[in-house]
């Protein structure tokens, strides 16, 4: 028995619904009474769902799971995970049998967008060129593990005396703090670009420094 | 008629080896999954191993990872375990079963019995 | 140990219904199914009922299957000498990815 799950993982933002998608091709005559279903985590083997009896045997994960009962009988053995979590990341699988057996692991990704980077400065007043600065940038709750990339004015990448930490809420979610040390010249602009490596998404935030005021666009 | 006729098993000392064979007739053998289930003397039913129709799932007991391997041929509608390292503890009849509806098994073989002893 | 858990023996007299428990988890018996399968003494298991209460073709009605929850169970009504046999529940686990069987009854018609 062919069970077809997509090559590439599901993509799905925290909070929100991800269906992992798992399809066979039933025979002619096939009806929802011989159907076995099963969906568990691949790893740990802990059951997530079922289908057995003709009949939804139920969520067995936080009650956050569901069939599509009306594809089921076209071979859609779908499963719907409700409210997305980071620790909902990992391999399903979804096992079915009837009168042969079958079964394919499909991959969740979990992702959630960085926030614009807030930019702060120290000191903060009296600067001069020639003194060193520290530029914190700061990102929240995003998910996976940020690139943080630092460039001045001209676009030339800054990649010494830079420290980025990374610390995981409750929630799993990442707040990212990168912190540029830097001489400065007589202006400048320094720019710190915070990127999801799932989203392909780009989180800018940039402090400019001329003489007196200093602005933070 | 739906037959399932297993050969292949003796005696033999342990760290032995053995393949144990299944021919099958009466059904369309190349569309169903196929197990091996084992007896010990006088006691219970054990399940050793199962496959599916082309072979691409292939499922253990514990008890035998490792050591046994299932496979089949559609061919020539013939199923095989293949037993390396054998132990005592896997002295039994050996049942040949075809896969129903439901995780059941509806037809079985009669049986060959291993016994590994020294 | 087995999985599934079965009462060793069971007893009864001619005509009489006799049940024969068998005892499992969320992961086998809660989320799939059981089957049954008659072991008469010398001979291989037979297929007695699947998916918890069908019964394959061949197979008296005096034989009935059930489940609710993670427990099954086989009643046999109008005991007759000749369903002196092994009886094993089994299933598929999906936290073990493996069927499983019972311990089995031996079931004696006095």
């Known amino acids: 028995l062919e069970v077809q799950v997509p090559e590439d993982p599901v993509v799905a933002l925290v909070g929100t619904d991800a269906t992992l998608c798992c399809s066979f091709s039933p025979e002619p005559g096939f009806s929802l009474a011989q159907l076995n279903l099963i969906w568990q985590l691949t790893d740990t083997k802990q059951l997530v769902h079922s289908f057995a009896e003709g009949q939804d045997q139920g969520s067995a994960y936080a009650n956050r799971t569901a069939l599509f009962p009306d594809l089921l009988a076209q071979g859609n053995a779908s499963l719907r995970l409700q409210r997305v979590r980071v620790a909902d990341e990992g391999s399903f699988t979804c096992f079915v049998s009837i009168r042969d057996f079958g079964s394919a692991a499909v991959s969740l990704q979990v992702a959630a967008p960085y926030s614009k980077p807030s930019m702060t400065l120290e000191p903060n007043k009296d600067l001069r060129p020639g003194d060193t600065v520290t530029i914190t940038c700061s990102s929240y709750r995003g998910y996976p593990e940020a690139e943080v990339f630092w460039q001045d004015g001209q676009g030339v990448p800054l990649t010494g005396n830079v420290t980025t930490s990374q610390m995981a809420n409750e929630q799993g979610l990442f707040d990212v703090h990168s912190v540029l040390r830097v001489v400065l010249g007589a202006n400048g602009t320094y720019s710190c670009l915070v990127r999801n490596p799932v989203l392909q998404q780009d989180a800018h935030g940039s402090v400019t420094i001329t003489g007196q005021p200093m602005t933070f666009p | 008629e739906v037959q399932l006729l297993e050969s292949g098993g003796g005696l033999l000392q342990p760290g032995g080896s053995l393949r144990l064979s299944c021919a099958a007739s009466?059904?369309?053998?190349?569309?169903?999954?196929m197990h091996w289930v084992r007896q010990a003397p006088g006691k219970g039913l054990e399940w050793v191993a199962a496959?599916?129709?082309?072979?691409?799932?292939?499922y253990y007991a514990d008890s035998v990872k490792g050591r046994f391997t299932i496979s089949r041929d559609n061919s020539k509608n013939t199923l095989y375990l293949q037993m390396n390292s054998l132990r005592a503890e896997d002295t039994a009849v050996y049942y040949c079963?075809?896969?129903?509806?439901?995780?059941?098994?509806?037809?079985w073989g009669q049986g060959t019995t291993v016994t590994v002893s020294s | 140990q087995s999985v599934l858990t079965q009462p060793p023996s069971a007893s009864g007299t001619p005509g009489q219904r006799v049940t024969i428990s068998c005892s499992g988890s969320?992961?086998?018996?809660?989320?799939?199914?059981v089957n049954w399968y008659q072991q008469l003494p010398g001979t291989a298991p037979k297929l007695l009922t699947y998916?918890?209460?069908l019964r394959p073709s061949g197979v008296p009605d005096r034989f009935s299957g059930s489940k609710s929850g993670t427990s099954a169970s086989l009643a046999i009504s109008g005991l007759q000498s000749e369903d002196e046999a092994d009886y094993y529940c089994?299933?598929?686990?999906?936290?073990?990815?493996?069927?499983?069987f019972g311990g089995g009854t031996k079931l004696t018609v006095l």
């Open positions: 079963t075809k896969y129903y509806y439901h995780y059941a098994m509806d037809v």
């Open positions: 969320r992961s086998d018996i809660g989320a799939t199914t």
């Open positions: 009466g059904f369309s053998f190349s569309s169903y999954g």
């Open positions: 089994a299933s598929w686990d999906a936290s073990l990815n493996t069927w499983v």
């Open positions: 998916q918890s209460h």
């Open positions: 496959i599916n129709s082309d072979g691409s799932r292939i």
